[in-house]
């Protein structure tokens, strides 16, 4: 069974998938469609890297631009380095500026919804 066939079989169960499952899926050429991606738990999407999202979505990654103001894409963008977002070739804006350090302060982030940044 190839990645696409596997994805069709598990698609209806993905809404509650944890980050670990999404990371594993990203290695299997599943080409998740945007509609499915938009239904994923925000907390599961946030830890994914740009490279992992690109592998997870395949050609569907082109649809991120139209969804950049909507959750979970909006919140995910805020967590990524702008340099990494730029590699997607979609003009996505709102990432962590180059030269900034991301402090993983869980309580701060839980309260504000955004990571704590330390300037250059």
């Amino acid at each position: 069974m190839n990645g696409s066939e596997y994805f069709v079989k598990i698609q209806s169960f993905l809404g509650g998938a944890p980050t670990e499952d999404l990371k594993a899926l990203s290695q299997q050429n599943v080409s998740m469609d945007l509609a499915t991606f938009m239904k994923l738990r925000t907390d599961a999407v946030l830890p994914l890297t740009v490279a992992e999202v690109q592998k997870l979505l395949g050609p569907h990654v082109e649809g991120l631009k139209a969804e950049e103001r909507h959750r979970p894409v909006r919140d995910w963008i805020l967590r990524q380095r702008q340099d990494d977002l730029d590699t997607l070739g979609l003009g996505l804006q709102g990432g962590i500026p180059n030269g900034y350090l991301v402090l993983d302060l869980s309580m701060q982030e839980a309260l504000s919804g955004t990571p704590c940044l330390l300037g250059p």
Epitope: D33, Q54, H60, G63, A66, T87, L90, G91
Partner: antibody
């Protein structure tokens, strides 16, 4: 003003390869994927594939996957489409097209003028 | 892939006539369809996107409607300059597909 300027007409022999260029101007080249569409004489439009201009990752229509190569040169804001093992059925006008990402995956709002490729022995 | 079935493939109408072209998608594409006009030797020109949104500068005699799988493109009063081939495009999927085209001629 957004412009996509393509290379000139080509005449090729069967079995040869052709490389068509598309030079973009008037916008940030790395903010929009570039797509290629072809049109055989008297026929409809056929999507061939696209390429991420920032890191060069292409996605191809399955029909062309074994013969097409899409590349970009960021330094000159130019996209290229190379088609190999040409046959007479590849005689067509080849267009580059830029999408507008207003909704979903984006529709094409700007097109190159087209490059005519003739395959003849 | 999503197939787009466009009909008719050609039509002949008189100046002032109402002209209707349809596109049927092989699966639900919401409202993600665009319509293009192409004249001989020219690149396609975008007329309508998101089913019914007219591009700036496009005459109001052009309109579109539909959702899901069935879509309609209408020229309310055909003009001589409208002689062209018209195509629909689905962009609900990253692997874009066009309808087969409709050639519009004057009687």
């Amino acid at each position: 003003e957004v412009q996509l300027v393509q290379s000139g007409a080509e005449v090729k022999k069967p079995g040869a390869s052709v490389k068509v260029s598309c030079k973009a101007s008037g916008y940030t080249f790395t903010n929009y994927w570039m797509h290629w569409v072809r049109q055989a004489p008297g026929q409809g439009l056929e999507w061939m594939g696209n390429i991420n201009p920032s890191q060069g990752g292409p996605y191809y229509n399955e029909r062309f996957r074994s013969r097409v190569t899409m590349t970009v040169d960021k330094s000159t804001s130019t996209a290229y489409m190379e088609l190999s093992s040409l046959r007479s059925e590849d005689t067509a006008v080849y267009y580059c097209a830029r999408p507008y990402y207003g909704s979903s995956y984006g529709y094409f709002d700007y097109w190159g003028q087209g490059t005519t490729v003739t395959v003849s022995s | 892939d999503i197939q787009m079935t466009q009909s008719p493939s050609s039509l002949s109408a008189s100046v002032g006539d109402r002209v209707t072209i349809t596109c049927k998608a092989s699966q639900d594409i919401n409202k993600y369809i665009a319509w293009y006009q192409q004249k001989p030797g020219k690149a396609p020109k975008l007329l309508i996107h998101y089913t019914s949104e007219l591009q700036p500068g496009v005459p109001s005699r052009f309109s579109g409607s539909g959702s899901g799988t069935d879509f309609t493109f209408t020229i309310s009063s055909l003009q001589p300059e409208d002689i062209a081939t018209y195509y629909c495009l689905q962009y609900a999927n990253p692997l874009r597909t066009f309808g087969g085209g409709t050639k519009v001629e004057i009687k």
